[in-house]
């Protein structure tokens, strides 16, 4: 700030310091600073310091303040969707139908057409239409990882419901990985949550797109509402513009 | 806003409208509105409308914008901690030691002493000191629910580490429940994540406060760092002040 | 909170969210946004009185501090707090596009 | 982002976070806060030029819009974006207390 503004800067600092005086007292609901007449001599007790340090130190899993949005997030995101590969595709034959899981596969060439580069993707959601559910169900989402292994992604506790309802899972990181790799087909698995000692592991929830024996016209409606990936990405031409102005202010 | 301010309000509206014109175009990186000369006649294609509706509708599990902080969150929170009941307490005898779980119990009278009313609690964290870990481990946290049932709370993927590290789980809702109920002892269970088809369900992670056969002096240090609940709450006298001024602006 | 529930139903003179509906055609003269036809943009307006000085009657200051200058700014300002995105449909050439614009709708304001 | 990394190392004249360390004893004349001895409060300062008008050379406006008036305010203002809490230790009588004060440290600013 130019020299002629120095006085202003000092004035602003003084006003800020005075405001902080009021802020701290008001946050503590103190009309004036507490008297120090009864404070025991010597250092603070160990237990108090330990408690102060516990509060001061951020720890793993504690939510930090939200990060300010990067410049790229200011700009509009193009929205596209990629439907799940239909269940009569041969890819599904490799995965034995089980009572505890359903499988959802996606064609990565369709993903790449929508989002040419992984860095352009700002959000990917897996959306599933769950049909009515009689009992509470705890489900888990997995990502197909290697030949026959699955990597845990997230979980959801589904409340009973009389009406169909869309579910959404944030799978941004996973789709970004897929776009970086060379695979042709990638997939998810939705499973019942299995606890270490419980034996009842049936997936009760009915997801649109997986039930069979429907009337033809219903099957079409059903197919349209089958699981899909909702993608939000910076269009390529807008991204190129962004990169070229990255180091300008 | 008083009548003499009306002109200002209209001016502000006009400036806001003009600013929105610039905002939308700049977010789309358009120098001017796109020409409509090539737009096909007739309504928007069904698929485009479906996509627009998918984007517009918030769905279960999709993160909404963060809620603005309630007035009570402005004021300072007193921080206290309640240590886990030591493992030689008889309560632990009721729960058979298993390879997949460890148990942590808390004395609710100590919790009530720190937070006299459930509504005063603004945050409760369960903090555990994990010792070094050789392999990645997926763990789950459960809350003791009724006689012998456990309710799933959350999970964490722990990366291998050569040094001890504090873990934190947000258990605000659970502790608020405990403060509302009459129980004397309440507890958590930390378990290995058990998938429906995998058989290897051993809890590999070593949590401070659970290993036995230590030297006496070490055991004390160990005991100080045993799992604890870190509580942040509005002090009772400050809360009463808040309630009385709730309907004033 | 200084949100639409409180502000739209009160005659608050200080910082609050104010109603503003933007009709793309009428207000901006635009026909190129096909969906929606308009949206509730809203805006923040109203003073954030600077209520700290050493000689102020103190208990009154405390009661108001968290509304008028919670961030202890040297010059508090009425600004958006909660914002929501807006999806739009428009054409580029012959191709329809759905795009999401972040932070377009003001739901609440704050003195900051 | 207009954060400490960028602003403390630049001579940015527009909206930015500015350094301010508060020493409780020296700056506020307080001995009653036992921990910490002070903290980096910082503050936001600098203009947010209102850069929209119909006759502006347009491409220049677009490039700056997201910094100077991303929220399309009628009068954009330089305010805190990321804030952090501050724990303190003080005595009430003979009893030491640990309290957490929310939103005390300004980490970044924005035009809003």
């Amino acid at each position: 700030l130019s020299t002629c503004k120095t006085i202003d800067m000092e004035l602003v600092k003084r006003k800020r310091i005075e405001a902080i005086r009021g802020q701290i007292l008001s946050k503590l609901r103190l009309a004036s600073p507490p008297s120090q007449g009864e404070v025991p001599p010597g250092p603070l007790p160990e237990a108090v310091l330990a408690l102060y340090n516990s509060t001061r130190d951020r720890v793993a899993g504690e939510s930090a303040e939200p990060e300010p949005e990067p410049e790229a997030d200011y700009y509009a995101k193009e929205v596209t969707r990629v439907l799940m590969v239909e269940t009569h595709n041969e890819i599904y034959d490799k995965f034995k139908q089980s009572t505890h899981s359903i499988y959802m596969f996606f064609n990565t060439s369709e993903l790449r057409e929508a989002v040419p580069e992984p860095v352009l993707l700002s959000r990917a959601e897996l959306r599933l239409l769950r049909l009515k559910l009689k009992v509470e169900q705890h489900v888990e989402l997995y990502q197909k990882y290697s030949n026959n292994s699955w990597r845990y992604l997230s979980n959801r506790l589904l409340a009973p419901s009389d009406s169909p309802e869309w579910l959404s899972f944030d799978v941004t990181g996973v789709v970004r990985q897929w776009l970086s790799r060379g695979g042709e087909i990638e997939g998810f698995r939705l499973s019942a949550h299995c606890s270490c000692d419980s034996r009842d592991n049936t997936l009760q929830v009915d997801i649109n797109g997986f039930t069979t024996g429907r009337r033809g016209d219903l099957a079409t409606i059903h197919g349209m509402n089958r699981p899909f990936l909702l993608l939000m990405a910076t269009p390529l031409e807008r991204a190129q513009h962004l990169q070229s102005s990255r180091h300008r202010r | 806003l008083s009548t003499c301010k009306t002109i200002d309000m209209e001016l502000v509206k006009r400036k806001r409208i003009e600013a929105i014109r610039g905002q939308i175009l700049s977010k789309l990186r358009l120098a001017s509105p796109p020409s409509q000369g090539e737009v096909p006649p007739g309504p928007l294609p069904e698929a485009v409308l479906a996509l627009y509706n998918s984007t517009r509708d918030r769905v279960a599990g999709e993160s909404a914008e963060p809620e603005p902080e309630p007035e009570a969150d402005y004021y300072a929170k007193e921080v206290t901690r309640v240590l886990m009941v030591e493992t030689h307490n008889e309560i632990y005898d009721k729960f058979k030691q298993s390879t997949h779980s460890i148990y942590m119990f808390f004395n609710t009278s100590e919790l009530r002493e720190a937070v006299p009313e459930p509504v005063l609690l603004s945050r409760a964290e369960l903090r555990l000191l994990r010792l070094k870990l050789k392999v990645e481990q997926h763990v789950e946290l459960y809350q003791k629910y009724s006689n012998n049932s456990w309710r799933y709370l959350s999970n964490r993927l722990l990366a291998p580490s050569d040094s001890p590290e504090w873990l934190s789980f947000d258990v605000t809702g659970v502790v608020r429940q405990w403060l509302s109920r009459g129980g004397e002892i309440e507890g958590f269970r930390l378990s290995a994540h058990c998938s429906c088809d995998s058989r290897d369900n051993t809890l590999q992670v070593d949590i401070n406060g659970f290993t036995t056969g230590r030297r006496g002096d070490l055991a004390t240090i160990h005991g100080m760092n045993r799992p604890f609940l870190l509580l942040m709450a509005t002090p009772l006298e400050r809360a009463q002040h808040l309630q009385s001024s709730r309907h004033r602006r | 909170a200084l949100d639409t529930n409180y502000c739209f139903s009160s005659t608050e003179k200080n910082c609050c969210v104010r109603q503003l509906y933007i009709d793309f055609r009428k207000d901006l003269g635009w026909k190129w946004i096909h969906e929606p036809k308009g949206y509730h943009a809203n805006f923040c307006l109203g003073p954030c009185p600077y209520i700290w000085s050493l000689d102020t009657q103190y208990s009154k200051v405390l009661a108001l501090y968290n509304q008028h200058n919670p961030g202890a700014s040297a010059a508090p300002c009425c600004v958006p707090q909660a914002l929501e995105p807006l999806p739009i449909v428009y054409y580029v050439g012959r191709k329809p596009k759905v795009e999401q614009l972040s932070n377009m709708i003001v739901r609440s304001c704050k003195c900051s | 982002a207009l954060d400490t990394n960028y602003c403390f190392s630049s001579t940015e004249k527009n909206c930015c976070v500015r350094q301010l360390y508060i020493d409780f004893r020296k700056d506020l004349g307080w001995k009653w806060i036992h921990e910490p001895k002070g903290y980096h409060a910082n503050f936001c300062l600098g203009p947010c030029p209102y850069i929209w008008s119909l006759d502006t050379q347009y491409s220049k406006v677009l490039a700056l819009y997201n910094q100077h008036n991303p929220g399309a305010s009628a009068a954009p203002c330089c305010v805190p974006q990321a804030l952090e809490p501050l724990p303190i230790v003080y005595y009430v009588g003979r009893k030491p207390k640990v309290e957490q004060l929310s939103n005390m440290i300004v980490r970044s600013c924005k035009c809003s």
């Epitope: - | 001017s32 509105p33 | 003269g29 050439g93 012959r94 191709k95 | -």
Partner: antibody, heavy 120, light 107 residues
Framework: EVQLVESGGGLVQPGGSLRLSCAAS????????MSWVRQAPGKGLEWLGF??????????EYSASVKGRFTISRDNSQNSLYLQMNSLKTEDTAVYYC???????????WGQGTLLTVSS | DIQMTQSPSSLSASVGDRLTISCRAS??????LNWYQQKPGKVVKLLIY???RLHSGVPSRFSGSGSGTDYTLTISSLQPEDVATYFC?????????FGQGTKLEIK
């Protein structure tokens, strides 16, 4: 710097054919519509047609006066635009310009033009 | 097709003068009106797009205004290098059409 350079003009007899070229540089060619505009001696400008960009599938659009006789094409690997003109008439005599078209409904960069004369 | 009518067809003015050229469309063109400058033997240049937006590198003495069917190009202080023919063009509806031009010379 955006540059457009037309070539291929000359003298052709009525009923004859000719192909004009336009070499583009200084921008990402596939991102833009490319257009042809002509100007008869002492007259105004007339838009002939354009070829769309990659997102719009490189499809074409023509003015009624040349539809069926003129064809616009592009070679994206060479950053080149072409105008194939068949069944030429004397009234096709003009300076032919290639221009970059933007989605805003305007032509932001033009070539210097190439003269076509149709005469027997 | 939308007809574009420019007036005057020619214009003579002195250096420093303020002058205007008009363009009328046969129907509402929603501000999709652009202005071009053509100097003898030089490339056609875009001056103004979407009624009033100045293209990069164009001097600020050029400005545009208008709405609906009537639009104006203004030169606030004529310079010798402004000698040229000026064309308007609508970008609202295919086919894009141009005005017949206004030839500007210096007295």
């Amino acid at each position: 710097e955006v540059q457009l350079v037309e070539s291929g003009g000359g003298l052709v007899q009525p009923g004859g054919s000719l192909r004009l070229s336009c070499a583009a540089s200084g921008f990402t060619f596939t991102d833009y519509y490319m257009s042809w505009v002509r100007q008869a001696p002492g007259k105004g400008l007339e838009w002939l047609g354009f070829i769309r960009n990659k997102p719009n599938g490189y499809t074409t659009e023509y003015s009624a006066s040349v539809k069926g006789r003129f064809t616009i094409s592009r070679d994206n690997s060479q950053n080149s635009l072409y105008l194939q003109m068949n069944s030429l008439k004397t009234e096709d005599t003009a300076v032919y310009y290639c221009a970059r078209y933007t989605g805003g409904g305007y032509f932001d960069y033009w070539g210097q033009g190439t003269l076509l004369t149709v005469s027997s | 097709d939308i007809q574009m009518t420019q007036s005057p067809s020619s214009l003579s003015a002195s250096v420093g003068d303020r002058l205007t050229i008009s363009c009328r469309a046969s129907q509402d063109i929603s501000n999709y009106l652009n202005w071009y400058q053509q100097k003898p033997g030089k490339v056609v240049k875009l001056l103004i797009y979407y009624t009033s937006r100045l293209h990069s590198g164009v001097p600020s003495r050029f400005s545009g205004s208008g709405s609906g069917t009537d639009y104006t190009l203004t030169i606030s202080s004529l310079q010798p290098e402004d000698v040229a023919t000026y064309f308007c063009q609508q970008g609202d509806t295919l086919p894009w059409t141009f005005g017949q031009g206004t030839k500007l010379e210096i007295k």
